[in-house]
């Protein structure tokens, strides 16, 4: 503790200049005080002053007022300053002396002589207000006031309790009437060195080094750390914790980028076709007469299905086309014939059976003719048989479709995922992606087919926790962890839902 | 009862950086009742206070180190380092670590052995 | 930057009191911790807030600080008390060591 006893002298009267001894002061009595201020007793005794003792120079001759004074000699109140705990009672001793000698040091003279003293004992509570009081005897009065006050920086009702305020990382504070701290804004805890985050900072998620600020324990994001962070290249997904990829709907693959819905998202079929999904980016465009490509993108001609019987040829016109019938044929597709069986009309080999009392006939033809004269070789590609662009080829009498790359089936109907020719060695596992396949490699492999034995295994030293699995070639660290549910972290070192005391890794 | 160990080498080329790790044992790193601080003396010298560091990672640098310091904590494994860069031979100095205490005012109660590192070529 | 001035050594014989001061601006309205070092040993923390003794530390150190001083005062001085003794104080965020002061 630690606390000054202050005494303030006012007046003291010795009319008659006596001393007590009875003599008198020549000219006067030159007039100074030994104050001696120690432990309680009920019984005033000589000996230390356990408290402290000072003395004044000269204050007046006789009879006078003390002023107060504030520094220099002659300071009033005198000051008893102590470094220990104020024990709410005390003995205190003032004495008026006459001195002949020196004004200011008076103390130190020879002839002193005592004028009078008086002996105050009793309990005194630290605070700022001044008891006053008066002692007088037969021919003295002294009139004074004292208190006890505690030092700077020391607080309570024994000026036992030390308090600086302070404004750094060990406390941000100020301090209360009775020493306890008062925290400054925007900190809290016992030493007010705890800071008070951003409002609505996530407990456990976010975190702060100073008040109003919210930073993201890792996997975390947003204003309030309330928001996970999807796993990284996560395309069409979302998480509810950190490092997932819950794909949105029509999307699938570790990474919720490959197109599972490619013709609603892209509505690749043009021209009135039919879309048809077959699986990750696959789709088949079914065509509306009239049109072929991939995309049904191609507008045929209006001859294309050679509407002309009967060996008539087709010219296109504007928005139809035109019939020109061979002779003894008529009708739009030259499709009314003027000609019976006499005029032997049947070509390749075709049979004629006359028909309406012979006013007509029909040709019965041989294998690979057709038509209504069995005037055309069959062309088994002229429905346009092959699906996505595959190439159709009359192989006698039948026919096949040449595929394009990445399609199989007897039509071409049949999506081949870049995956099926296995182009992932030492056991890789193989993702359809956009820009084609990517391999997943083994412990022990990398590269883009994980054809590279590595010399060094990143998997080896198992550096994911938790029982994550390990996976090597997939980014630059060399491995990544796949973490199993309830777990995050580049290395799964993370339980989820953490209490907020939690050490995380700044 | 903690205790604190310094790690690293104890000689470095000037114009590199010092690199150096105190392991904490028989206690958390992760405790908001301290901060662990880095504090130097050179050979016949006084001590000079470098940095702190709490398990948040809030850090704080003695002005006329700042520009060459670096604190960081660890706290799965109960660590934290100092780093000071572009050292010169003024640097050469025992480094210790210590814990320095919220609820003791910001006294520290807790030191390591130190560590001598010398920087010469 | 902020500085605390220590004197250089102080001599005292042995039972008698030794008094270190350590000195800087307004030094009283800071906190003051004093550390003691012996030769090839770390420091140890032997009064901290002024006047407090940590567990272990001896009834015979004390400390004061107001105005702008500090005092560490070892009464009885052993022998086992010779060594350095620095005064710390905290400067906003900055921790500030004294010179040092040598007691033989």
């Known amino acids: 503790g630690s606390g000054i006893f202050q005494l303030r002298l006012q007046e003291f009267v010795n009319q008659r200049g006596m001393l007590a001894n009875g003599q008198s002061c020549e000219p006067g009595c030159r007039t100074f005080f030994r104050i001696c201020l120690k432990h309680f007793q009920a019984t005033f005794s000589e000996g230390p002053c356990t408290f402290g003792n000072v003395s004044t120079p000269v204050l007046g001759t006789n009879s006078f007022v003390v002023r107060d004074k504030n520094s220099g000699s002659g300071r009033n109140p005198l000051q008893l300053p102590f470094n220990f705990t104020w024990p709410g009672t005390f003995s205190l001793n003032i004495q008026a002396w006459h001195t002949p000698g020196d004004d200011l040091r008076p103390e130190t003279s020879p002839g002193n002589s005592l004028i009078s003293q008086i002996i105050i004992q009793g309990s005194l509570a630290v605070g700022k207000i001044w008891r006053t009081d008066e002692q007088n005897d037969t021919l003295t009065r002294l009139s004074y006031s004292y208190r006890v006050i505690c030092s700077d920086n020391y607080y309570g009702e024994s000026c036992s309790r030390l308090c600086k305020k302070r404004d750094d990382h060990f406390g941000h504070y100020e301090c209360q009437p009775d020493g306890s701290l008062s925290c400054l804004p925007g900190w809290t805890g016992k030493y007010c060195d705890q800071p008070i985050c951003l409002s609505g900072c996530h407990e456990q998620n976010g975190y702060c080094s100073k008040p109003d600020e919210c930073i993201c324990r890792p996997g975390w994001q947003g204003r309030l750390c309330n928001e996970c962070i999807p796993h990284n290249g996560c395309r069409h997904g979302t998480c509810s914790i950190p490092w997932q990829c819950a794909c949105d709907e029509g999307w699938g693959g570790l990474f919720c980028d490959q197109d599972l819905n490619y013709c609603t998202h892209h509505s690749p079929c043009k021209n009135g076709s039919t879309c048809s999904n077959s699986g990750p980016k696959g789709y088949t465009c079914t065509c509306l007469p009239g049109y072929t490509g991939e995309h049904c993108e191609l507008g045929l001609s209006k001859c294309a299905s050679n509407p002309c019987r009967n060996g008539g040829s087709c010219k296109d016109q504007e928005n139809s086309y035109h019939c020109l019938c061979p002779p003894g044929y008529y009708g739009q597709h030259c499709e009314h014939s003027t000609l019976t069986c006499a005029d032997s009309p049947c070509f390749n080999g075709g049979s004629c059976r006359e028909r309406n009392q012979g006013s007509s006939y029909a040709c019965e033809c041989p294998p690979n003719f057709t038509g209504s004269n069995c005037e055309k070789k069959v062309d088994r590609c002229t429905s346009n048989p092959c699906a996505n662009g595959g190439q159709c080829q009359n192989r006698g009498p039948s026919r096949t479709c040449r595929c394009r790359p990445g399609f199989t089936g007897t039509h071409c109907e049949l999506h081949i995922s870049d995956c099926a020719r296995s182009p992932c060695a030492h056991g890789g596992t193989c993702h359809d992606l956009e820009n084609g396949p990517v391999c997943t490699c083994p412990a022990g492999f990398s590269g883009r087919r994980c054809e590279v034995r590595i010399t060094h295994d990143a998997c080896a030293s198992g550096p994911c926790f938790n029982g994550a699995t390990c996976y090597t070639g997939l980014s630059p660290n060399n491995f990544v962890c796949n973490c199993p549910y309830g777990f995050v972290g580049s290395r799964c070192e993370f339980p989820v839902g953490l209490p907020p005391s939690f050490p995380w890794v700044a | 009862e903690v205790q604190l160990q310094e790690s690293g080498p104890g000689l470095v080329k000037p114009s590199e950086t010092l690199s150096l790790t105190c392991t904490v044992s028989g206690g958390s790193i992760s405790s908001s009742s301290y901060y662990w601080g880095w504090i130097r003396q050179p050979p016949g010298k006084g001590l000079e206070w470098i940095g702190d560091?709490?398990?948040?990672?809030?850090?704080y640098y003695n002005p006329s180190l700042k520009s060459r310091v670096t604190i960081s904590v660890d706290t799965s494994k109960n660590q934290f380092s100092l780093k000071l860069s572009s050292v010169t031979a003024a640097d050469t100095a025992v480094y210790y670590c210590?814990?320095?205490?919220?609820?003791?005012?910001?006294?520290?109660?807790?030191w390591g052995q130190g560590t001598l590192v010398t920087v010469s070529s | 930057s902020y500085e605390l001035t220590q004197p250089p050594s102080v001599s005292v014989s042995p039972g008698q009191t030794a008094s270190i001061t350590c000195s800087g601006d307004?030094?009283?309205?800071?906190?003051v911790s004093w550390y003691q070092q012996k030769p090839g040993q770390s420091p140890v923390l032997v009064i901290y807030?002024?006047?407090q003794r940590p567990s272990g530390i001896p009834e015979r150190f004390s400390g004061s600080n107001s105005g702008d001083t500090a005092t560490l005062t070892i009464s009885g001085t052993q022998p086992m008390d010779e060594a350095d003794y620095y005064c710390?104080?905290?400067?906003?965020?900055?921790?500030?060591f004294g010179s040092g002061t040598k007691v033989t």
């Open positions: 710390q104080a905290w400067d906003s965020e900055t921790g500030v």
């Open positions: 307004m030094l009283g309205d800071k906190y």
């Open positions: 560091i709490n398990y948040i990672g809030s850090t």
């Open positions: 210590a814990r320095e205490s919220v609820p003791l005012g910001g006294g520290a109660d807790e």
């Open positions: 807030e002024d006047s």
